[in-house]
Structure formats: C-alpha cells, structure tokens
Interface confidence: low
C-alpha cells in the first residue's frame, strides 16, 4: 500500500480467482484513543472499533472511503483505491491502446517546436467518475522540472456504438534549452482513477522525436506570364522555433488532381517558394519538416489551382 | 577553417557537409522512429558519447559571442563518432557493404572534422570507450543506438553551421 495523495491510498493486488488479497491497517488521524468506530462509504454499518482498523482487501467491494468517527463526529477519512496486477502485468483498463506508432501506446505526445512545450493526449471510453493527474520530468534518476497543466477533455467522437473521449495536457520544461542536443528523455506519468480503480501510464521521449511543425502559413500562388507554371510561396508557421536560420525547415510541395488516383507531382525544397505546373482543378499543398532531423511532417497547407 | 587564434571556419562548406551528414545518418538508419531503443537496455553504451549541451555556446547567441567553444565541442563529437564508425562495432560481423551509407558517413565525419581543424592544430579529443560486444546481435543493436545518437548530434551541428553561414560568414 502507498499514499497517492493526502488520505488517498493505493492497494496493489495480484488479481486472480481466490487471491488472498492484501492486509491493510488503517489508523485514525486523531489524538483520541477510545470510543472510535469505523464505517465504509455511505453505510452506517460499524466495521470495527478502536484507533486502528485491520481489513483484508481482496476486491473492489473492500475499497472505498473508510471513515473513523467518535460520538457522531467525523475524525478522519482514508480512501482506498485498487491497482490490479494480472499475470504480472498492471491493468490498463481505463485508457485505450492507440496502437500508433506501436502496440501498447496509451499516451501520445507532440511538440510544435523546440521550446520545451509539448502536448500529450490519450483516449478512453469512460465518461464519468474519472480523474487524471499528470507529472513529468526530464530524466528519472536526477529529474529536472517539467510543469504540466490540467488534463482536459479535448474531443468527443462516436466510434461505432461507442463514444470515445480524448483528454489532453500541455507541459512545459522549466529550463528548456532549445539549441542543445537532448541526452536525457522527457518522462511523462499519468495517474488515472476510475471510481475505485487506479492505473498509471508512462511515456518516455526526446522532444526532437515528437516534433511536428504546424503547416506552412500564407500559402500563395503567383501565375508566371505566358506559362502554365505558377510560383508557390509560403512562410514558416508562427509556432516554429526562431531564428529560422538556425531552426530551419524543409518543405514538400505537392500538386494533386481532383481525383485521388491522379499522379501526384512532388517537389522537395529548403526554400519558401517553388515553381510548379498548375493543372486545371488541381490543388497545391505544402508541408514542412525539420530540415536536419527526420521527425514528423506537418499537416498539409493547401490552395486550389484555379 | 578554424585555426588557432579563433578565426572563422569556412561556414558555407561546413554547412553543406553537415547537411550531407544529416542525410547520410538517416539513410544509414531510416527506421529509427519505429524502434524504441531505450527499451532494449544497455543504457550505458551510448551514455558516454559527447553531447552538445546547454553551456556549450552552440545557440545563436553563443555563436555570436564566441563560436570557438561550440566549434571545439562539435569537433570533439565528430572525432568521437568517426572513431566509433571505424571501430570493430561497425567493421565486425554482420559486415557492411563497402559503399553503404555508413562508409560514406564515416568519410564525411572525417571530412568535416578536418575542415574544422587544420593539420598541426589540436583541440583535445574525448577518449573513446571500449565497446566490444561479443554477440553479433548486440553489435547490431549498438550500431542502431550509435546512429540514433549521431542523428541527434549532427542535427545540432548542421543548425550551427547553417546559422553561421547565414549570419557569421565574412
């Protein structure tokens, strides 16, 4: 058993039929010595008396809020949550496996630049009685600070018969050094509690590996005289790290016909303009990637040819 | 070339060669994004590589103030990786083809380090740890880790030279 936060405890249980469970001793937080009784949740049934209460925790029915009282007055509470271990593996019932980029990916994270700010998100089909707590650090043995904001519901989607909820959190490295080569990964830890079930999820990454720039901005076309060619120009996204002479992007320019089956023409360039042939009913798209490190491409910015 | 007394390197040449290094490092180990090498253990094997750290003056402001600190750090790293790529880890079994990207990478690391340091002038170089895994599969894993680490190193070096070429070239 360990303390998650004040008066909230997590009992780690091997979960199999007829498992013996875990013996837990609860102590009433009071100078009082006698006349103390214990109850569980909203029930008025007295579970025991005395300053300590010994219970055998085997299942969710044994978890909940234990309260000690004296003469009708509440003295203290202890909330017991269960963390299940099945076949040596901690349960992952609360969050959905996103399977990208690999199986058992519960947390996904992205950064728009090298400022040390990043966003992580996760999915669940649970809509109520759900809380998350997010902590992060750079490195684990001698951790350096990363401050995470609040995990908030960022999207709701219908997937077949199920509703899926996406939660996200923004974190910022306290003393980020955008120009340095990272040697220690960022660690993200998410505590999830659904009713009386506790689970934890972790992710470890370098900012450089989760970089995904925003799409190029101000995408414009300028027709060239007496030609089917156009000059496409664009700018670095506002959210990208500066100066751009240091934090450079490379770009992919694509001409795509109306039909998905039509051949795509692609040009790669480090410049912020390119000359392409604009076909009728086609569209021109541009996306960006870090010039020197192959992290994710941005989403496309598009403009019609006409 | 960076010469004693702190004159400027050939920023544009360094920029071109460092960008080529980035391309080669990724072609030598392109699937790196889909492999979480930290899960494989052997943390210590790549912990000894030189990293370009916050105080090394490789940020835009540090380069403007005095680029020599940063260039020295980059030079150390280039020599280190050049030695690693020429070591038993890469030359032993399973053997690489003579014209593999790793061979080109090795040559380019040497080329850039020579651009930064002409004959007769020596910055101190970091000792290369003795990494001689006995099993071929361990060697393979170690190659991946070294290339992964090299990709991050040359990305920072390329940013430095691109910025230098754009803002510090005479």
């Amino acid at each position: 058993i360990w303390e998650l936060k004040k008066d909230v405890y997590v009992v780690e249980l091997d979960w199999y039929p007829d498992a013996p469970g875990e013996m837990v001793v609860l102590t009433c937080d009071t100078p009082e010595e006698d006349g103390i009784t214990w109850t569980l949740d909203q029930s008025s049934e007295v579970l025991g008396s005395g300053k300590t209460l010994t219970i055998q925790v085997k299942e969710f029915g044994d978890a909940g809020q234990y309260t000690c009282h004296k003469g009708g007055e509440v003295l203290s509470h202890s909330l017991l949550l269960l963390h299940k271990k099945e076949d040596g593996i901690w349960s992952t019932d609360i969050l959905k496996d996103q399977k990208e980029p690999k199986n058992k990916t519960f947390l996904r994270c992205e950064a728009k630049n090298y400022s040390g700010r990043f966003t992580c998100w996760w999915l669940t089909t649970i809509s109520t009685d759900l809380t998350f707590s997010v902590k992060s650090s750079r490195g684990s043995s001698d951790p350096q600070g990363v401050t995470c904001g609040a995990a908030t519901l960022s999207a709701e989607r219908v997937r077949g018969d199920n509703k899926e909820y996406e939660y996200s959190v923004e974190c910022q490295e306290d003393s980020a050094c955008p120009a340095a080569e990272e040697s220690l990964p960022i660690e993200v830890m998410v505590d999830a509690v659904h009713k009386l079930k506790y689970e934890n999820y972790t992710s470890s990454f370098f900012i450089r590996d989760i970089i995904k720039p925003d799409p190029p901005k101000n995408l414009q076309l300028k027709p060239l005289k007496n030609s089917r060619q156009v000059e496409v120009s664009w700018e670095y996204p506002d959210t990208w790290s500066t100066p751009h002479s240091y934090f450079s992007l490379t770009f992919c320019v694509q001409v795509q016909g109306k039909s998905k089956r039509e051949k795509k023409d692609r040009v790669f360039t480090d410049k912020t303009s390119a000359t392409v042939i604009c076909r009728k009913n086609a569209s021109i798209s541009v996306r960006a990637q870090d010039r020197y490190y192959s992290s994710s491409w941005s989403e496309w910015a598009s403009v019609p040819c006409s | 070339r960076a010469v004693p007394g702190g004159s400027s390197p050939a920023w544009t040449q360094c920029q071109q060669l460092s960008q080529k290094l980035c391309t080669l490092a990724w072609s030598a180990h392109p699937l790196v994004g889909h492999m979480d090498l930290r899960e494989e253990g052997d943390e210590e094997t790549t912990n000894d590589v030189p990293h370009i750290q916050c105080g090394d003056g490789c940020d835009p402001q540090g380069l403007r103030d005095n680029s020599q600190f940063c260039l020295q750090r980059i030079h150390q790293g280039l020599i280190f990786y050049e030695k690693l790529l020429g070591s038993d880890i890469f030359t032993g079994e399973p053997s690489l083809l003579p014209d593999s990207p790793v061979a080109q990478l090795h040559a380019s690391l040497l080329g850039l380090s020579q651009l930064l340091q002409p004959e007769g002038h020596h910055w101190e170089t970091q000792q290369i740890p003795s990494l001689s895994p006995s099993q071929p599969w361990q060697r393979l894993l170690l190659r991946f880790k070294i290339l992964r680490s090299l990709q991050a190193f040359v990305a920072v070096a390329a940013r430095v030279f691109a910025h230098g070429a754009a803002t510090l070239s005479p």
Epitope: K5, S133, C148, L153 | -
Partner: antibody, heavy 127, light 108 residues
Framework: QVQLVQSGAEVKKPGSSVKVSCKAS????????ISWVRQAPGQGLEWMGL????????YYAQKFQGRVTITADESTSTAYMELSSLRSEDTAVYYC????????????????????WGQGTLVTVSS | DIVLTQSPATLSLSPGERATLSCRAS???????LAWYQQKPGQAPRLLIY???RRATGVPARFSGSGSGTDFTLTISSLEPEDFATYYC?????????FGQGTKVEIK
C-alpha cells in the same frame, strides 16, 4: 456551439429564496464545472461556488456557506443556484460560468479559467 | 483568501495608446491559475488571457499578459475603440476564487 442560457430576472422579498437556472445548450456538461459569480450594481465580480455536474460535488465560498445551494441535473444539462435568506445586499446580476474540468499535480479540480458565461440574471431583493 | 489588487482603478487613454494594467496578489499565485477578463456595461465578462499569458480563442494579438508570483500585467499594445471597458484579473489557485476590483479603461 455551446451556450449557457440563464433564467429570467427575479424580484424577491427579504428573507425569501431565489433559484436561478443555467442550461447548457449545444454541448455536454460532463467535461466542465459550472461556477456561479455575482456582481452587485456598479461593483466587481464575486465567486460564490461551483458544481461538478457529473459527480454532483459542490464547493462554496465561505461567505455563502449555509445560504447557497448549487445543484445540477445532468440529464437536462442544467445547473441551479439557490440563495436563501435574501437581504437587500444580495441584489445583483448572477452569472453562471463554465470552467473546463482539469487536473494539476493532483486530482480533478476546477483550476481552469471561466471561458464561457451565461447572459446573467438580475435578482432584485426589495420589500 | 487571496486578495487581488488592481491598479490603477481608472485609466484614461486615447485610441492608439498603450494600456498597462497591473494585478498584485496578496500571496503567490501559480501563473497557471491567473486569468484576465474584459467586461462592457450590460454584458457578461469575456475571457481574454489565461495561464497569465495565453490568449483565449478569438482574442486579438494586441492583448498580452505577463508576470508570475504576485505581480501580473495585462497590456493592450494599441487601444481600439472597442477596448474601452472594465478589466478584471482572477485567481483560481485557492478557493474561494477571487477577482480584482477591476480597472476601468476610459476614453480620454
């Protein structure tokens, strides 16, 4: 687009109670807290308390403890604020405001800003 | 309770001028818990800035927030006619959540 729509103006006698409603239209209640904030004529804003519509747990400012009751009906996406033992100084515009549900180094807590407000309900207490 | 003191109480400026509004807390407030609101007569408040420095959706770039600990600032770089209103800072660090008494920005 989500909107918070409040009930109409009320005139009440001192000592009586008033119950103001706040309905979320075009969205879900579940990911939000609903706070109640009041503003006396020509005065500043004063937070009264809030409710988590899913868990039903309400927090009240000490000043209003015992006089205010905040409730919510998730099925109709409506929150209610009832203020009892009214006095003339309770004359104010009462606003409901949404704050997204969040976590911060602890558990669910309404630490987010009030990003959506109702139009306000004027409650006049006069004999 | 955390007391937020805003200054000045009234700011008389002309369109195009820069407005600097101050909010001082009686005890330290994490910047993640500080917000600024704009209120016009007869209207509900509108969120401008949260996390001390982040602009809310649809808020023009002329509005910016800064500060940490006990001292926070809202800056309007160049006043537009529609910016003349009352501005409130708010902390959600501790319950009860509290607002400053407001700064009225009026046309000179």
């Amino acid at each position: 687009q989500v909107q918070l729509v409040q009930s109409g103006a009320e005139v009440k006698k001192p000592g009586s109670s008033v119950k103001v409603s706040c309905k979320a239209s075009g969205g879900t209640f579940s990911s939000n807290y609903i706070s109640w904030v009041r503003q006396a004529p020509g005065q500043g804003l004063e937070w009264m308390g809030l409710i988590d519509p899913v868990f039903g747990g309400a927090y009240y400012a000490q000043k209003f403890q015992g006089r205010v009751t905040i409730t919510a009906d998730e099925s109709t996406s409506t929150a209610y604020m009832e203020l009892s033992s009214l006095r003339s100084e309770d004359t104010a515009v009462y606003y409901c405001a949404r704050s997204k549900k969040g976590m911060y180094g602890g558990w669910t807590y309404p630490l987010m800003m009030f990003d959506l407000w109702g139009q306000g309900t004027l409650v006049t207490v006069s004999s | 309770d955390i007391v937020l003191t805003q200054s000045p109480a009234t700011l008389s400026l002309s369109p195009g001028e820069r407005a600097t509004l101050s909010c001082r807390a009686s005890q330290s407030v994490s910047s993640n818990y500080l917000a600024w609101y704009q209120q016009k007569p007869g209207q509900a408040p509108r969120l401008l800035i949260y996390y001390a420095s982040r602009r809310a959706t649809g808020v023009p770039a002329r509005f910016s927030g800064s500060g940490s600990g006990t001292d926070f600032t809202l800056t309007i770089s160049s006043l537009e006619p529609e910016d003349f209103a009352t501005y409130y800072c708010q902390q959600t660090s501790n319950t009860p959540f509290t607002f400053g008494q407001g700064t009225k920005v009026e046309i000179k």
